[in-house]
Interface confidence: low
């Protein structure tokens, strides 16, 4: 199975009902504290606003946030940690009417209410300490 380059950046157009699917594996064991970061940007630039920031501190916690006018807003933290050390996982981010719902291996674990219109999202970036085998957007 071929690996996608990381950071992986893709132009997208999202709306209610869209699903972003990511298949990946942590690069190192959890003891070494790998991260996964997924950012939904409002422009095709890394320094643009972020409608949805999803960061996994493997073996520890998950943080969600948005960045508006270059300022990070109120962080939402979850201690739910369904990711397993050394195991491949499937991450699905569902765009619902009122929120993003994040599913891990088919189960819903995280919710993040929309702060910036989904129609503003132009690019998704997946990066940090993972090997990436799949990135797909379905509308």
């Amino acid at each position: 199975m071929s690996l996608l380059s990381v950071p992986h950046t893709e132009s997208v157009s999202l709306s209610t009902g869209s699903t972003v699917t990511i298949e990946a594996r942590p690069l190192v064991c959890f003891f070494n504290e790998p991260h996964l970061q997924v950012d939904f940007h409002t422009e095709m630039k890394e320094d643009s606003d972020i409608a949805f920031h999803f960061q996994v501190y493997f073996g520890n916690r998950v943080v969600m946030n948005s960045r508006e006018y270059r300022t990070w807003k109120e962080e939402v933290e979850s201690k739910n940690m369904p990711f397993q050390d050394g195991q491949e996982f499937e991450l699905r981010i569902l765009v619902l009417e009122d929120k993003y719902q994040v599913m891990v291996n088919g189960q819903a674990y995280y919710n993040f209410n929309h702060r910036i219109p989904v129609s503003s999202v132009k690019m998704v970036q997946v990066w940090r300490d993972i090997s990436l085998t799949k990135f797909n957007v379905s509308n």
């Epitope: 959890f30 003891f31 073996g59 520890n60 201690k79 739910n80 940690m81 369904p82 990711f83 397993q84």
Partner: nanobody, 121 residues
Framework: QLQLVESGGGLVQAGDSLRLSCAAS????????MMWFRQAPGKEREFVAA???????YCANSVKGRCTISRDNAQDTVYLQMNSLKPEDTAVYFC???????????????WAKGTLVTVSS
């Protein structure tokens, strides 16, 4: 297989403290996340506290500030200390082990049989 056996339950007065123990035998105890759940009569099983294999702890909002969870890997035992007990803490308390750090009863790999804690006013 991982066998889990609790002890320490019983009848206590409101305002008192209690320490529950959960002794493990079988598989490598230290590689599991350890959880405590409870089930009050007629209610669903609810999450109480978690202890990650790396040592991080987390207590549910219902017991926050009154709860301490710890483990002794040398003794293969996990402990739940509950302070300032209330009548609404009355329940059967279950120890559980999971490979995933998830506060969902359905995600647990192993369960103990449960120990009854009754808090009288």
């Amino acid at each position: 297989q991982l066998q889990l056996v609790e002890s320490g339950g019983g009848l206590v007065q409101a305002g008192d403290s209690l320490r529950l123990s959960c002794a493990a035998s079988g598989r490598t105890f230290s590689s599991y996340h350890m959880m405590w759940f409870r089930q009050a009569p007629g209610k669903e099983r609810e999450f109480v506290a978690a202890l990650a294999w790396r040592g991080g702890t987390y207590c549910a909002n219902s017991v926050k500030g009154r709860c301490t969870i710890s483990r002794d890997n040398a003794q293969d035992t996990v402990y739940l200390q509950m302070n300032s007990l209330k009548p609404e803490d009355t329940a059967v308390y279950f120890c559980a082990a999971s490979r995933r750090y998830v506060f969902d009863p359905s995600a647990m790999d192993y369960w103990a049989k449960g120990t009854l804690v009754t808090v009288s006013s």
